[in-house]
């Protein structure tokens, strides 16, 4: 048993038919030594008296807030949590899988560019009872420091039958160059807690393995005369590092009617600008990746050809 | 240290075209690690990263952007001296931070070549033969340090007289290569930068 | 399976013309782009020009240009090369390659030599 | 136009040897670069596109790398049936240019 927070505790269970549980001692924080009585949750049944209470956890019924009382009066509680481990591996019940870039990708992090900011995201079908905590820390062993607010609910969507909600924090560390060379990883711990479960999620990362730029901006088309080629030009976008001349990006220009599987143009350049041939009905887009190590690709920046 | 925007002549950057091709070099060699050593630890998330430089050469911070010594996180207080007389600086009015941020380049590049001959070595002695380093990288090593073309004290090769431990050797390799692939992407933004500048 | 079908051998005289054919099957005609690239004997490949069959838009070498028509008909689904003012240099074999991609070639057909000898 | 240069416009190589082919673009184009193979009498066949993607069907031993303008196509462990010419052509620009070829010969 462990603290999570003031009068937050977690018990870890090997989770098995049968499994002999945790024998956990509570102390009621309180002076007094008599007349102390113990309830668990609504229920008014008297588990047991005396300043300390020993209970079995084996299973969610035994979890919950544990209250000790004097005379109707209430001196302290605390709240039980159950953390399962099943054939020695923790349960990960809250969180789905993303499956992307592998599978047990729990947390996803993105960042604009290589000022030390991120935002994780994760899903879940749970609507209710559900709080999230987020730390984070530049290495482990001398962690330094990285800030990161709320989680908050940022998309909800419907899947099949069931709802899916995106919850996503946002962190900064808190010195960060952007041109330094990092060798310790971004270390994201997110715990999770479900009415009287509770699991913890991480992720380990360099910033430079999860940018993603945003797209180019100000897309912009000229007809070039006697041809059917245009001259596309565009912008850095207003959120990646600075010097572009130090952080440069590449781009992948592409002209491509509505479905994907429609003929297309596609040119890939350093420049910030390109010759495409346009086509009626179709759109020109571009979108940008860092030039010297290849991260993620940008979402497209989209204009229609005519 | 910082670079000032400085304005080389517009034939300063033979550099650029030599940083461009360490990159490809280093990175192609980085992938061919990891497909031929598939059951080591070979990954990015697998290695320790270790930077053979660290305390010898300053390179992110002798060759940081006039734009970001504003930013105190970027301003370390580590001291080298460097010597100045490279072919890439194409005037003598060529300031002394870009000198010490291109002799700082040269150093690194000294340092990871002794290095990764003396690995190569002890690969050709292995009896499963299973990876070499890729001569062209080697040579395009040594390209850019002609290219910066700066006088310094020759190191020695590492010669060690113990039977090499193969399996260690081979992951050694792999954490040289994450981190020379790191610093190779420093250098062409550094080049990069300077070019445009 | 994409396969494109080129028509036959054709002997020239300098200064006539010359149309070769190139059928498609085994895709939908208009959602590939058309190319010719010709290649003379014991030389390299150079390409002339591509034809959008969906809406008849072509793009030619500039060297070629006033010499060279590339037509597509969707009915036939055939793509069609005419050469004119042919002259002894213009002897080579004429391929046709189609892509969804305009700027490289995924399918080939198996080549028409033209041969040009007074 | 832009030109491409292809080195060495002839190898010489065995059966298991390691053959790098290195095309040069008369000015950048970034990774808007394709491999062909061609065998005597028969069209060209498509091997890598933009630079280093590699086809369906294309034995993995054929890998390509390069941008800007230096580029190679790398044949790891040669086979009999990769005797043949290939050439490289960039797609940066129209007129779509190919390099003169490299001949890959038996020693």
């Known amino acids: 048993i462990w603290e999570l927070k003031k009068d937050v505790y977690v018990v870890e269970l090997d989770w098995y038919p049968d499994a002999p549980g945790e024998m956990v001692v509570l102390t009621c924080d309180t002076p007094e030594e008599d007349g102390i009585t113990w309830t668990l949750d609504q229920s008014s049944e008297v588990l047991g008296s005396g300043k300390t209470l020993t209970i079995q956890v084996k299973e969610f019924g035994d979890a919950g807030q544990y209250t000790c009382h004097k005379g109707g009066e209430v001196l302290s509680h605390s709240l039980l949590l159950l953390h399962k481990k099943e054939d020695g591996i923790w349960s990960t019940d809250i969180l789905k899988d993303q499956k992307e870039p592998k599978n047990k990708t729990f947390l996803r992090c993105e960042a604009k560019n290589y000022s030390g900011r991120f935002t994780c995201w994760w899903l879940t079908t749970i609507s209710t009872d559900l709080t999230f905590s987020v730390k984070s820390s530049r290495g482990s062993s001398d962690p330094q420091g990285v800030t990161c607010g709320a989680a908050t609910l940022s998309a909800e969507r419907v899947r099949g039958d069931n709802k899916e909600y995106e919850y996503s924090v946002e962190c900064q560390e808190d010195s960060a160059c952007p041109a330094a060379e990092e060798s310790l990883p971004i270390e994201v711990m997110v715990d999770a807690v479900h009415k009287l479960k509770y699991e913890n999620y991480t992720s380990s990362f360099f910033i430079r393995d999860i940018i993603k730029p945003d797209p180019p901006k100000n897309l912009q088309l000229k007809p070039l005369k006697n041809s059917r080629q245009v001259e596309v030009s565009w912008e850095y976008p207003d959120t990646w590092s600075t010097p572009h001349s130090y952080f440069s990006l590449t781009f992948c220009v592409q002209v491509q009617g509505k479905s994907k599987r429609e003929k297309k143009d596609r040119v890939f350049t350093d420049k910030t600008s390109a010759t495409v041939i346009c086509r009626k009905n179709a759109s020109i887009s571009v979108r940008a990746q860092d030039r010297y190590y290849s991260s993620s690709w940008s979402e497209w920046a989209s204009v229609p050809c005519s | 240290r910082n670079l000032p925007v400085a304005t080389p002549d517009p034939g300063m950057f033979p550099c650029l075209h030599h940083s461009q091709n360490l990159l490809r070099a280093v990175s192609n060699m980085l992938q061919k690690a990891r497909q031929t050593l598939e059951f080591y630890p070979c990954t990015s998330e697998e290695i320790d990263h270790e930077d053979i430089t660290k305390d010898k050469t300053s390179t992110v911070e002798a060759c940081l952007p006039l734009e970001l010594t504003k930013n105190e996180s970027c301003l370390n207080s580590r001291e080298t001296s460097f010597i100045t007389n490279g072919s890439c600086l194409a005037s003598r009015k060529t300031s002394f931070m870009m000198a010490l941020c291109l002799s700082s380049i040269y150093e690194d590049l000294k340092m990871y070549q002794v290095e990764f001959k003396t690995m190569n070595a002890k690969l050709l002695m292995d009896p499963k033969r299973q990876i070499f380093l890729d001569q062209n990288m080697l040579a395009v090593i040594d390209e850019l340090m002609q290219a910066l073309n700066f006088n310094s004290e020759t190191v020695p090769q590492k010669s060690s007289l113990e039977e090499p431990d193969f399996y260690k050797t081979k992951i050694k390799l792999c954490i040289l290569l994450h981190a020379f692939r790191i610093r190779a992407v420093t250098i062409d933004r550094v080049m990069s930068y300077l070019n445009a500048s | 399976e994409v396969q494109l079908v080129q028509s036959g051998a054709e002997v020239k005289k300098p200064g006539a013309t010359v149309k070769i054919s190139c059928k498609a099957s085994g895709y939908t005609f208009s959602d590939y782009y058309l190319h010719w690239v010709r290649q003379a004997p014991e030389k390299g490949l150079e390409w002339m020009g591509w034809?959008?069959?969906?809406?008849?838009?072509?793009e030619y070498a500039p060297k070629f240009q006033g010499r060279v028509t590339i037509t597509a008909d969707t009915s036939t689904d055939t793509g069609y090369l005419e050469l004119s003012s042919l002259r002894s240099e213009d002897t080579a074999v004429y391929y046709c390659a189609a892509n969804k991609e305009l700027r490289y070639f995924d399918v080939w057909g198996q080549g028409t030599l033209v041969t040009v000898s007074s | 136009d832009i030109q491409m240069t292809q080195s060495p416009s002839s190898v010489s190589a065995s059966v298991g040897d390691r053959v790098t082919i290195t095309c040069r673009a008369s000015?950048?184009?970034?990774?808007?670069l394709h491999w062909y193979q061609q065998k005597p009498g028969k069209a060209p066949k498509l091997l890598i596109y933009?630079?280093?993607q590699s086809i369906s069907g294309v034995p993995s031993r054929f890998s390509g790398s390069g941008s800007g303008t230096d580029f190679s196509l790398t044949i790891n462990s040669l086979q009999p049936e990769d005797f043949a010419r290939y050439y490289c052509?960039?797609?940066?620009?129209?007129?779509?240019?190919f390099g003169g070829g490299t001949k890959v010969e038996i020693k």
């Open positions: 052509q960039q797609s940066n620009s129209f007129p779509l240019t």
């Open positions: 034809i959008d069959p969906e809406n008849g838009d072509t």
């Open positions: 000015q950048s184009i970034s990774i808007n």
């Open positions: 933009f630079a280093s």
